[in-house]
Interface confidence: low
């Protein structure tokens, strides 16, 4: 999947299986990524687990789990708030669009999470105070925590290079260099560009991600995934000057 | 061990003379001792990762608070934390920091925080 980190680095990761996105004293988020096509290196998120840790007088530990074709509007125990404590309503799940869009607000830690199902796969976005991000017991054992450190270099796909290589060509040309098997022949580069431009008029990294996804999979739902990801940034990012990210040299993952 | 949970426990035991079932007229003192105990555990949280006594204490304080109808707010023998503990190496960073009014949004408890964003989508 495409990852925008807490430090506004933008990466395309081929990480497969379960990986931690966030892990601190209050919140743990883990994603499971699966290949989008058999044999493909490109992966998308098929499962998401969010654990809101027990927080003294405010909330009981609550676990939220979403999977492909299952975007519940409740925690795994069936509740929609933080439990029986007097501050339980400082953690709330709201269903925005049934089966497609859920928002979780954890007021006690100033955090908003948006989970969507777009096509077969899930998207995730969070707004969280730096103070909460930094509330970890032991920095040295934090390991690979994607939102903070990004993907390991050997798990990144340089999709910007594919974007450059494929301008004016069809999917057949991309397939030779692509991390995925040949996408449907009926999806030329020009069509991908047109479909992405329709939803993402600014040629930023979200637009480029959209083009990459369409050429890699032939699945038009990925257009919407990029569109909603940008919409979520508009809602959640505190720096309005950083909504759009533009092409630049690929970052090394953070320490 | 740098984890000072046993010190917190013994201070609590001294303060309550080893009694966990005080007479009703002792309850204010017992609750004050519990709040001091809670504060002590928060202060040592950072160095108590994986320590059984620490995690047992955190849960037990909550149990005892409710058993004896102690309010979270009230006198202690030490100053109290009302905010999320600061980041960095502060001794007061904690597993389960206390916020007095969960319902109020986060920035009521500290200066307006710097927010940050992370997102994951597509392939």
């Amino acid at each position: 999947p495409h990852l925008r980190t807490f430090t506004d680095r933008f990466q395309t990761c081929k990480v497969q299986g379960a990986w931690p996105l966030i892990d601190n004293n209050y919140l743990n988020v883990q994603v499971t990524n699966t290949p989008v096509l058999p044999g493909s290196a490109a992966t998308a998120t098929s499962k998401l687990t969010i654990i809101f840790k027990n927080f003294q007088e405010c909330v009981d530990q609550k676990v939220y789990q979403a999977e492909m074709d299952e975007l519940p509007a409740a925690f795994v125990d069936g509740s929609k708030n933080g439990g029986d404590k007097h501050g339980a309503n400082s953690l709330k799940i709201t269903e925005k669009v049934s089966g497609q869009h859920v928002e979780i607000r954890a007021k006690y830690i100033g955090t908003t999470i948006v989970v969507r199902q777009v096509g077969r796969y899930l998207t995730f976005a969070v707004r969280v105070p730096e103070e909460v991000v930094n509330a970890v017991e032991d920095w040295d054992s934090q390991g690979l925590y994607l939102c903070l450190r990004g993907c390991p270099l050997n798990q990144q796909i340089d999709f910007q290079a594919f974007h450059t290589n494929t301008e004016g060509t069809g999917a057949r040309r991309l397939a030779a260099a692509s991390p995925a098997p040949t996408a449907p022949e009926t999806f030329p580069y020009e069509t991908a560009v047109a479909k992405c431009k329709e939803k993402l008029p600014v040629e930023d990294l979200y637009y480029q991600a959209c083009v990459f996804d369409l050429l890699t999979t032939g699945d038009v739902n990925f257009t919407l995934a990029a569109y909603y990801a940008l919409e979520d940034v508009k809602m959640l990012h505190s720096n309005k000057d950083k909504l759009h990210l533009y092409e630049r040299t690929r970052d090394l993952p953070g320490r | 061990s740098p984890c000072k949970i046993l010190k917190c426990n013994s201070e609590f035991w001294s303060a309550t003379s080893g009694s966990h079932a005080p007479a009703s007229d002792d309850t204010p003192e017992f609750c004050a001792a519990l709040r001091s105990y809670a504060l002590c555990t928060r202060r040592t949280a950072r160095t108590c990762r994986g320590d059984l006594a620490y995690h047992s204490a955190v849960h037990g304080i909550e149990d005892l608070m409710s058993q004896h109808n102690c309010s979270k707010d009230g006198p202690t023998s030490q100053p109290r934390l009302h905010t999320l503990p600061p980041a960095g190496d502060s001794q007061e960073r904690s597993d389960s920091p206390e916020i007095c009014h969960c319902e109020k949004s986060f920035h009521k408890h500290s200066a307006t925080p710097n927010y940050t964003h992370c997102g994951l989508f597509g392939d």
Epitope: K53, N54, D60, Q61 | S1, C3, L6, N9, S10, F12, W13, Y37, R49, G50, D51, L52, A53, H55, S56, A57, H59, G60, I61, D63, L64, D95
Partner: antibody, heavy 120, light 109 residues
Framework: EVQLVQSGAEVKKPGASVKVSCKAS????????ISWVRQAPGQGLDWMGW????????NYAQKLQGRVTMTTDTSTSTAYMELSSLRSEDTAVYYC?????????????WGQGTLVTVSS | QSALTQPRSVSGSPGQSVTISCTGT?????????VSWYQQHPGKAPKLMLY???KRPSGVPDRFSGSKSGNTASLTISGLQAEDEADYYC?????????FGGGTKVTVL
């Protein structure tokens, strides 16, 4: 009723791994730690380690470090203990036990035990 | 060898009192409030009898009592009964280690 129900007996070859489960019911799983204790035939009790379902923190007996892994699944209120590189001296009954919550420390509820036999 | 030392066995007639000792160091027993005692009948799981040196969980008869002096914790069974015949283990929590005694076989004569 507070209960811990463990998985059935296992027979393993030396060098293999075993994973024992312990399903909790009748209480809030995340409010108490789970300890694992083993007892070799005719011997005393031997503490293996502890896990907090609340935080995921673990605390293993020094002599088992590197061979034992304790995990929990809060969605099913189940604790797991995996022991690798088994040797004949690991033959024992393995118990899970709930750790009493609080400034109190004790093991107040025990599973029925799982016999693990390591034999070639 | 266990970190806490218990006598291998003690015995007494019905109605008598028996005391089982559990000796450790100042850090494992002397300074610890976390000493607990467990009863185990053959083929059964252990059962908590006392915790935090002196406290009795509900359901445990009051003939079981605990004390501590220096680096030695003790379990006393007063008014011994036939069903008290079992193995008894002490446990102390010290730092991040849980220490077991080797166990004491109580025989009712």
């Amino acid at each position: 009723e507070v209960q811990l129900v463990q998985s059935g007996a296992e027979v393993k070859k030396p060098g293999a791994s075993v994973k024992v489960s312990c399903k909790a019911s009748g209480y809030t799983f995340t409010s108490h730690g789970i300890s694992w204790v083993r007892q070799a035939p005719g011997q005393g009790l031997d503490w293996m380690g502890w896990i907090s379902p609340y935080s995921g923190n673990t605390n293993y007996a020094q002599k088992l470090q590197g061979r034992v892994t304790m995990t929990t699944d809060t969605s099913t209120s189940t604790a797991y203990m995996e022991l690798s590189s088994l040797r004949s001296e690991d033959t024992a009954v393995y118990y899970c036990a709930r750790v009493g919550s609080g400034p109190y420390y004790y093991m107040d509820v025990w599973g029925q035990g799982t016999l693990v036999t390591v034999s070639s | 060898q266990s970190a806490l030392t218990q006598p291998r066995s003690v015995s007494g007639s019905p109605g008598q009192s028996v005391t089982i000792s559990c000796t450790g160091t100042s850090s494992s027993v002397g300074d610890s409030i976390y000493v607990s005692w467990y009863q185990q009948h053959p083929g059964k799981a252990p059962k908590l009898m006392l915790y935090d040196v002196t406290k009795r969980p509900s359901g445990v008869p009051d003939r079981f009592s605990g004390s501590k002096s220096g680096n030695t914790a003790s379990l006393t069974i007063s008014g011994l009964q036939a069903e008290d015949e079992a193995d008894y283990y002490c446990i102390s929590y010290a730092g991040t280690d849980t220490l077991f005694g080797g166990g004491t076989k109580v025989t009712v004569l």
